[in-house]
């Protein structure tokens, strides 16, 4: 008789999840000499230990504590790029501007990027059929708790000028319910962060509006100012040109506004 299995509303664990995490860890530690000391098998064991045999709606930040320790990586605190709803461009940017880091440029972020995972209470099985959806099922699921934990710690580490890339094509350019709006904004440390600089990325070719005047950006400015952090905002009217100018800053066309 087949065992009854909880059906969740979200997609199941990414296929070949253990192999993917282990392979990513090995690749990352080979590329980043400062992380060569990391034992990838121990990293996988800690990752697995955070959610295996646990109810996937009852995961806590403490469950990820061993993984957070093993994945320790000191990031230059003044080179942090946050993003919201515009991950691809943020990653393209840090691939060119190699001294800046998104969360996914760290080992822990790289391991989990675009993956889904969950287990089942009291069994050592990984659930490849379905995992809890944040809205429809529960917020304390393995994936959401992981990203909340690492995002909080990433924001805590930031100092000086922190940059955030925001998607100007969305109805809410700044969304209080995003990871940036609900976690990262509130965990920037005013004692060491001087300024949050928002880069609002325009979508349309002919869009010349000043999206820094958008009501949601004003809301972000208000939240940040109340936390005794300065706020500044820049429109990136031409993201393609922006990236090109990061690659080739001496290009003559890069002195004009982008």
């Amino acid at each position: 008789v087949p065992r009854w299995r909880q059906q969740w509303s979200g997609p199941g664990t990414t296929k070949r999840f253990p192999e993917t995490v282990l392979a990513r860890c090995v690749k990352y530690t080979e590329i980043h000499p400062e992380m060569r000391h990391v034992d990838c098998q121990s990293v996988w064991d800690a990752f697995k230990g955070a959610f295996i045999s646990k109810h996937p709606c009852n995961i806590t930040e403490e469950d990820y504590q061993p993984l957070m320790k093993l994945g320790t990586q000191t990031v230059p605190c003044n080179k942090i790029l946050l993003w919201s709803r515009i991950k691809d461009l943020a990653h393209q940017f840090t691939q060119v501007q190699r001294d800046m880091f998104t969360l996914e440029d760290t080992l822990l972020g790289y391991l989990a990027d675009d993956l889904t995972w969950c287990g089942e209470f009291n069994t050592s099985k990984i659930n490849y059929q379905s995992c809890p959806d944040w809205r429809k099922d529960c917020s304390n699921n393995p994936v959401s708790v992981f990203w909340k934990t690492v995002s909080r710690r990433f924001a805590e580490a930031a100092c000086d000028v922190v940059h955030v890339m925001l998607n100007g094509s969305r109805s809410k350019i700044f969304d209080k319910n995003s990871t940036f709006g609900s976690v990262e904004v509130h965990n920037l440390q005013p004692e060491k962060v001087q300024t949050l600089e928002a880069w609002v990325i325009h979508g349309g070719r002919e869009d010349s509006r000043d999206l820094c005047q958008d009501p949601t950006i004003k809301e972000l400015e208000s939240i940040i100012s109340k936390r005794n952090i300065q706020f500044s905002c820049k429109n990136i009217y031409r993201p393609d040109k922006f990236l090109q100018c990061v690659k080739n800053p001496e290009d003559s066309s890069c002195t004009s506004e982008i």
Partner: nanobody, 116 residues
């Protein structure tokens, strides 16, 4: 510049108590997971107790029920209350501050000797 300064070590009789304190400067203590480690002569450094930034605690089996770790973020200090001390607790005790993305720091250590 980050500094962790331990104090409170000393010589104590078996069954006695000591309270170790770690004063941090140069870091925002509240965002760090804090730990006490110890190293006895000829042995490896081992975790004694830790307290996360959220306040959750974890203890080595050998000290459970005898030691209590606590933190005062306002004062930038972490303490270790050690009761019912045994000769096996004799070691140099080190304070550690750890953050996933902001680094790890160690104090210089304080000697604890349990002997009659």
């Amino acid at each position: 510049q980050v500094q962790l300064q331990e104090s409170g070590g000393g010589l104590v009789q078996p069954g006695g108590s000591l309270r170790l304190s770690c004063a941090a400067s140069g870091i925002i203590l509240r965002i760090y997971d804090m730990g006490w480690y110890r190293q006895a002569p000829g042995k490896q450094r081992e975790l004694v107790a830790e307290i996360t930034s959220g306040g959750s605690t974890n203890y080595a089996d050998s000290v459970k029920g005898r030691f209590t770790i606590s933190r005062d973020n306002a004062e930038n200090t972490v303490s270790l209350q050690m009761n019912s001390l045994k000769p096996g607790d004799t070691a140099v005790y080190y304070c550690n501050a750890h953050h996933t993305f902001a680094g790890a720091y160690w104090g210089q250590g304080t000697q604890v000797t349990v002997s009659s």
